[in-house]
Interface confidence: low
């Protein structure tokens, strides 16, 4: 679809005569009839197949024709066509004299014709005007013409329809050749596909408008490149959605079972030593003077044997009190009323005077102790053996007999088979006399809980349209990760059918 435009510029009829040679009275009131038709080697009368147009009286005898396009007038003359421009044409321009006001053909005498020109040729669509001048013996006509496409039509033949749009069906403007030129942020054959936020993950993200990045199920982050771990995953991470890969020291389906309770919770109080002994399990070795699972309970002060020189300890409401043997006094019976002259050192101890004889000190032989060497050394009194070890006196030394699973001079080292956390998938480890045993969580079995016994919900291929299936470990159900253009719990709906719900 397009328009053949004819711009009349100047008509010269100096003598004011008709084609017959007869003069017009009083002058030739001139109007034009234009006929546009298909190409003819010899232009002949007949139907104006591409259209006709007539002008009003434009002037008398000789005159210039004003360009009237801006004022809504009729110059240039418009000959619209609604077919593919063939590239060739024939054009007949007739100048007529109008004796009266009626310009209809049937109202004019046949000899009212002033002049007639006929041209033919090829003409390409374009904005440039072709200037032409036709001269007869009595008249001269100067004019220009061109073919342009109608609005929304493009191409060499005005055959390409293109209408700019910015809606659901496309976001584009039209190029001079009629091809689409996408608006910023859009792509695709019809510019219907938004260009997502730069860096938005190709598989895990999508968008419904430019510079957006919406995440598919199982993914999060500005660019949808971070997986969402399994719902309830406490101390774990993922590399694909719904995974829960435990951080060091954690186990179980949700990585919520503590395999390093001592470090994470510091349960032992009052300076006690903590030992891990399995999942969420620990042992506190208390310092002297404390007891309880977490060594939270302070013992009676008398249990730390504060009274010296054989004094006996009595508990009191506000603390304790030492009852001292004869010859001693002080809060802890630490002061003596004796001197070396009284031979106070027993078991072969040698006496040394102090403070000008006012006091003394005994140097005891091996295996004896006390202010007066009165006590046989019992190296087990301080209960040095940890983890329930039994203390044995061996002459001048002592040794610890350890319970199964413990070793070291003081049974302080745990040699539990469970220390290596051998049970997989959060299984609970139990030390036995001759090894270990794993108690497995639901969905796992085997000596080390290494065998998965739960149903693989993805085995039946429940996801449609090439979606990726993930098994939800806690419920033995599946989650479908849909490809671009599909939604639904099984990715069964193309976008735009039922309303989508972005989770």
């Amino acid at each position: 679809s397009g328009v053949f435009q004819l711009q009349l510029q100047e008509f010269i009829n100096e003598r004011g005569v008709l084609a017959s040679g007869r003069p017009c009275e009083p002058g030739c009131r001139t109007f034009f009839r234009v006929c546009l038709k298909h190409f003819q080697a010899v232009v002949s009368p007949g139907p104006c197949t591409f259209g006709t147009v007539s002008t009003p009286v434009l002037g008398t005898n000789s005159f210039a024709v004003r360009d009237d396009s801006s004022g809504g007038g009729r110059n240039p003359l418009q000959l619209p066509f609604n077919f593919t421009w063939p590239g060739t044409f024939s054009l007949i321009i007739e100048a007529w004299h109008a004796p009266g006001d009626d310009l209809r053909p049937e109202a004019l005498p046949p000899d009212a014709l002033i002049s007639k020109i006929a041209i033919q040729g090829s003409l390409a669509v374009g904005q440039n005007w072709l200037l032409d001048e036709q001269t007869s013996t009595l008249t001269r006509l100067r004019y220009s013409y061109r073919v342009i496409c109608s609005d929304n039509y493009y191409g060499d033949n005005c055959s390409r329809l293109c209408k700019k749009r910015n809606d659901h069906f496309g976001h584009y403007v039209c190029q001079p050749d009629g091809n689409l030129s996408c608006l910023p942020g859009w792509t695709g054959e019809y510019c219907q596909q938004p260009i997502c936020l730069s860096g938005c993950h190709e598989q895990n993200g999508y968008c419904s408008k430019p510079a957006e990045c919406l995440c598919r199920p199982g993914w999060q982050g500005r660019l949808c490149n971070e997986c969402i771990p399994h719902n309830g995953c406490r101390h774990g991470t993922c590399s694909t959605p719904w995974q829960c890969t435990c951080d060091e020291g954690w186990g179980g389906l949700f990585c919520d079972q503590d395999l390093n309770y001592c470090t994470h919770h510091s349960p032992c109080k009052n300076g006690a030593t903590c030992s891990n002994s399995g999942q969420r399990s620990y042992t506190c070795t208390c310092r002297p003077g404390y007891t309880g699972v977490d060594c939270e309970l302070e013992l009676s002060e008398c249990d730390s044997n504060p009274c010296r020189n054989g004094g006996s300890c009595k508990d009191q409401e506000d603390g304790y009190h030492c009852l001292c043997p004869p010859g001693y006094y002080g809060l802890h019976c630490e002061h003596s009323t004796l001197s070396c002259a009284d031979s106070p050192c027993f078991n072969g101890g040698s006496c040394r005077e102090r403070n000008q004889g006012a006091n003394y000190a005994c140097e005891c032989p091996p295996n004896f102790t006390g202010s007066n060497c009165e006590k046989k050394v019992d190296r087990c009194t301080s209960n040095p053996c940890a983890n329930g070890g039994q203390c044995l006196n061996r002459g001048p030394s002592r040794m610890c007999r350890c319970r199964p699973g413990f070793t070291g001079t003081y049974c302080e080292l745990h040699v539990s088979d469970c220390a290596r956390n051998p049970c997989a998938h959060g299984g609970t480890c139990h030390d036995l006399e001759n090894g270990l045993m794993c108690t497995c969580p639901a969905g796992f079995s085997g000596r080390r809980c290494e065998v998965r016994t739960s149903i693989d919900a993805c085995a039946s291929s429940p996801c449609f349209n090439r979606a990726t299936c993930y098994t939800d470990l806690s419920t033995d159900t599946f989650v479908c990760n849909c490809p671009y253009g599909f939604v639904g719990s099984r990715c069964e709906f193309p976008v735009g059918l039922p309303p989508s719900f972005p989770w």
Partner: antibody, heavy 120, light 108 residues
């Protein structure tokens, strides 16, 4: 323990905008694992889900209210809010805010609710 | 949207009796996406069951959920005085999220 508390005017005139705020305490509103929702209950006891917001600012609304609805979040104040424009008497209800786990939109934690009456 | 129809509208029972509440969906709902709530006058709803059959934290084991597809059931094995309330089902597998109209369990 997460706690939610609604606040806002109890009386709104027809054609005006209903505005409510929900303050979250005892837990982080910035956790990526949750959606923060608004739900209302009509005097006749029917419950209607209004919409949700994620800490990232992404929202999803009930289509029946979408044209009148804005839900937004302010993580710095640990609050999310509801704006419902052009209200009528039909919007009179008890409005609740609630928290749902991401991917599983059941509501384990609710505010105590606030009655909003639309009347001139 | 998925319409959830609860029946009966009212259930009159005595303490100690068994209560069976029904929730029927207008189209299939994955059992992973159905929840039950209890609501007492002047209070917000309280989550009882999610995933059709998983009990929420602190919910007594007399409450149990079952069902799949379009038919779901909440069962209270022995009614305690504090169980008399309104019960709602909710689906969260399709947009918009929808609730049932509720079943009132009252003392006979």
């Amino acid at each position: 323990q997460v706690q939610l508390q609604e606040s806002g005017p109890g009386l709104v005139k027809p054609s005006q905008t209903l505005s409510l705020t929900c303050t979250v305490s005892g837990g982080s509103i910035s956790s990526g694992g949750y959606y923060w929702s608004w739900i209302r209950q009509y005097p006749g006891k029917g419950l209607e889900w209004i919409g949700y917001v994620h800490y990232s600012g992404s929202t999803h609304y009930n289509p029946s209210l979408k044209s009148r609805l804005t839900i937004s979040i302010d993580t710095s104040k640990s609050q999310f809010s509801l704006k419902l424009s052009s209200v009528t008497a039909a919007d009179t209800a008890v409005y609740y805010c609630a928290r749902a786990p991401r991917g599983y939109h059941y509501f384990a934690y609710w505010g105590q609710g606030t009655l909003v009456t639309v009347s001139s | 949207e998925i319409v959830l129809t609860q029946s009966p509208g009212t259930l009159s029972l005595s303490p100690g009796e068994r209560a069976t509440l029904s929730c029927r969906a207008s189209q299939s709902v994955s059992s992973r996406y159905l929840a039950w709530y209890q609501q007492k006058p002047g209070q917000a709803p309280r989550l009882l069951i999610f995933g059709a059959s998983s009990r929420a934290t602190g919910i007594p084991d007399r409450f149990s959920g079952s069902g799949s597809g379009t038919d779901f059931t909440l069962t209270i094995s022995r009614l305690e005085p504090e169980d008399f309330a309104v019960y709602y089902c909710q689906q969260y597998g399709s947009s918009p999220l929808t609730f049932g109209g509720g079943t009132k369990v009252e003392i006979k």
